[in-house]
C-alpha cells in the first residue's frame, strides 16, 4: 500500500529572465527513493539516481541546474517555460509517486509564489 505523499511548491510564478527552484518532498513513507525524474510535459529535464547521481538532459544543460537537494533550478526563464512540471519519485517497495508544479513565467515584475499544497 502506498502511504506516502508528495509536497510541492504548487502554483508558482517567476519573471522572464529570472530563475526558479522547483521543489518536491516525499513524506509519510519509509520507502527507499531509487530515482527522481523531473519532467516538463513529455520532456525529461533531469534525473537524480540514488546510485549514479544527477544527469541533465543535453537540451537543457545550459538552463537547468541540479538542486538544492532533489529539487531543480530553472534559469534564464522565458515565457515558453510556462506550463506543468512533474517530479516523479521512483521508490522501493511502494512504486511511483508524482508531484505537479505549475509555473507561470511573467513579462512583468509582479511574480508571487503560490502556497504549498499536497498531492496524496
Amino acid at each position: 500500500m502506498m502511504t506516502g505523499t508528495i509536497e510541492t511548491t504548487g502554483n508558482i510564478s517567476a519573471e522572464k529572465g529570472g530563475s526558479i527552484i522547483l521543489q518536491c518532498h516525499l513524506s509519510s513513507t519509509t520507502a527507499q527513493v531509487t530515482q527522481v525524474n523531473w519532467e516538463q510535459q513529455d520532456q525529461l529535464l533531469a534525473i537524480c539516481n540514488a546510485d549514479l547521481g544527477w544527469h541533465i538532459s543535453p537540451s537543457f544543460k545550459d538552463r537547468v541546474a541540479p538542486g538544492p537537494g532533489l529539487g531543480l533550478t530553472l534559469q534564464s526563464l522565458t515565457v515558453n517555460d510556462t506550463g506543468e512540471y512533474f517530479c516523479i519519485y521512483h521508490t522501493y517497495p511502494d512504486g511511483t509517486y508524482t508531484g505537479r508544479i505549475f509555473l507561470e513565467v511573467l513579462e512583468s515584475s509582479v511574480a508571487e509564489h503560490g502556497a504549498r499544497f499536497q498531492i496524496p
Epitope: T34, Q35, N49, D51, L52, G53, W54, H55, G67, G69
Partner: antibody, heavy 122, light 112 residues
C-alpha cells in the same frame, strides 16, 4: 569471499562484436547495482554502463550509447556487456564493479573484478 | 559532465614522509540535502583493479589503513598519505558521483 570475475575479452576487428561476462560470488547479487568501467592502455578510468539490481534502470556513457548493451541474470549471478560496432577507441581493460550500499548510497564502487582486455584492431 | 582535475600528475616521496594529492571538480559535488560530498578516492597498483579507499570525501572504507585520509568540500579535495609505505606505490584516482561518474586523470605515487 566477495568476488567478481570477468571473461570474454579478446581481439576483434573494427565493426565487430564481443560479449563480456562477469561472474559474481560471495554476496547477494540481485541486491546490488552493477557497472562496467573501462581503462584504455596507460590511461585513466571511464565509467561505461550501469544496471540496477532488478534491471529496471539502465544507463550508458554517451561514448557507447547505441552500441553497447548491459544486462544481468540474477539466477546465474552474472553481469553482461554486449559490445557491437566496436571501434579502435574501445580498446581497454573492462572491469565490472559493484556499487557500495552498506549504509546509505555513497555512489562509490567498492568491489572490482580483475578486468578483461578488449583489443579492437585490424 | 563534471571534469575532475588531479595534481600533480606524479609524486615522489621518501618512505615515512607525507604524500598529498589534490583533486578539483569543475562543479560542486556537495549534496545539500544530506551535506555529503560525493567524492571517492581509489588506489590502483600495477596490474590490479582499482581499490576503494575513501568515499564521501573523508570516510575511510573498511580495512583501509588510517594513514590514508581525505578532506575537502565543494570543489577542492585532498588525499593524504601521512607516512608513505612501500606498498603505497600506486596510481590514485578521484571520482565524483554528484553527476554520473567521472574520474580524475590519476596521480602516480613513487618512492624517492
Amino acid at each position: 569471499e566477495v568476488q567478481l570475475v570477468e571473461s570474454g575479452g579478446g581481439l576483434v576487428q573494427p565493426g565487430g562484436s564481443l560479449r563480456l561476462s562477469c561472474a559474481a560470488s560471495g554476496f547477494t547479487f540481485s541486491s546490488y547495482s552493477m557497472n562496467w568501467v573501462r581503462q584504455a592502455p596507460g590511461k585513466g578510468l571511464e565509467w561505461v554502463s550501469y544496471i540496477s539490481g532488478s534491471s529496471s534502470t539502465i544507463y550508458y556513457a554517451d561514448s557507447v550509447k547505441g552500441r553497447f548493451t548491459i544486462s544481468r541474470d540474477n539466477a546465474k549471478n552474472s553481469l553482461y556487456l554486449q559490445m557491437n560496432s566496436l571501434r579502435a577507441e574501445d580498446t581497454a581493460v573492462y572491469y565490472c564493479a559493484r556499487h557500495r550500499i552498506a549504509d546509505s548510497p555513497s555512489r562509490a564502487f567498492d568491489i572490482w573484478g580483475q578486468g578483461t582486455m578488449v583489443t579492437v584492431s585490424s | 559532465d563534471i571534469v575532475m582535475t588531479q595534481s600533480p600528475d606524479s609524486l615522489a616521496v621518501s618512505l615515512g614522509e607525507r604524500a598529498t594529492i589534490n583533486c578539483k571538480s569543475s562543479q560542486s559535488v556537495l549534496f545539500s540535502s544530506n551535506n555529503k560530498n560525493y567524492l571517492a578516492w581509489y588506489q590502483q597498483k600495477p596490474g590490479q583493479p582499482p581499490k576503494l579507499l575513501i568515499y564521501w570525501a573523508s570516510t575511510r572504507e573498511s580495512g583501509v589503513p588510517d594513514r590514508f585520509s581525505g578532506s575537502g568540500s565543494g570543489t577542492d579535495f585532498t588525499l593524504t598519505i601521512s607516512s608513505l609505505q612501500a606498498e603505497d606505490v600506486a596510481v590514485y584516482y578521484c571520482q565524483q558521483s554528484y553527476f554520473f561518474p567521472t574520474f580524475g586523470g590519476g596521480t602516480k605515487v613513487e618512492i624517492k
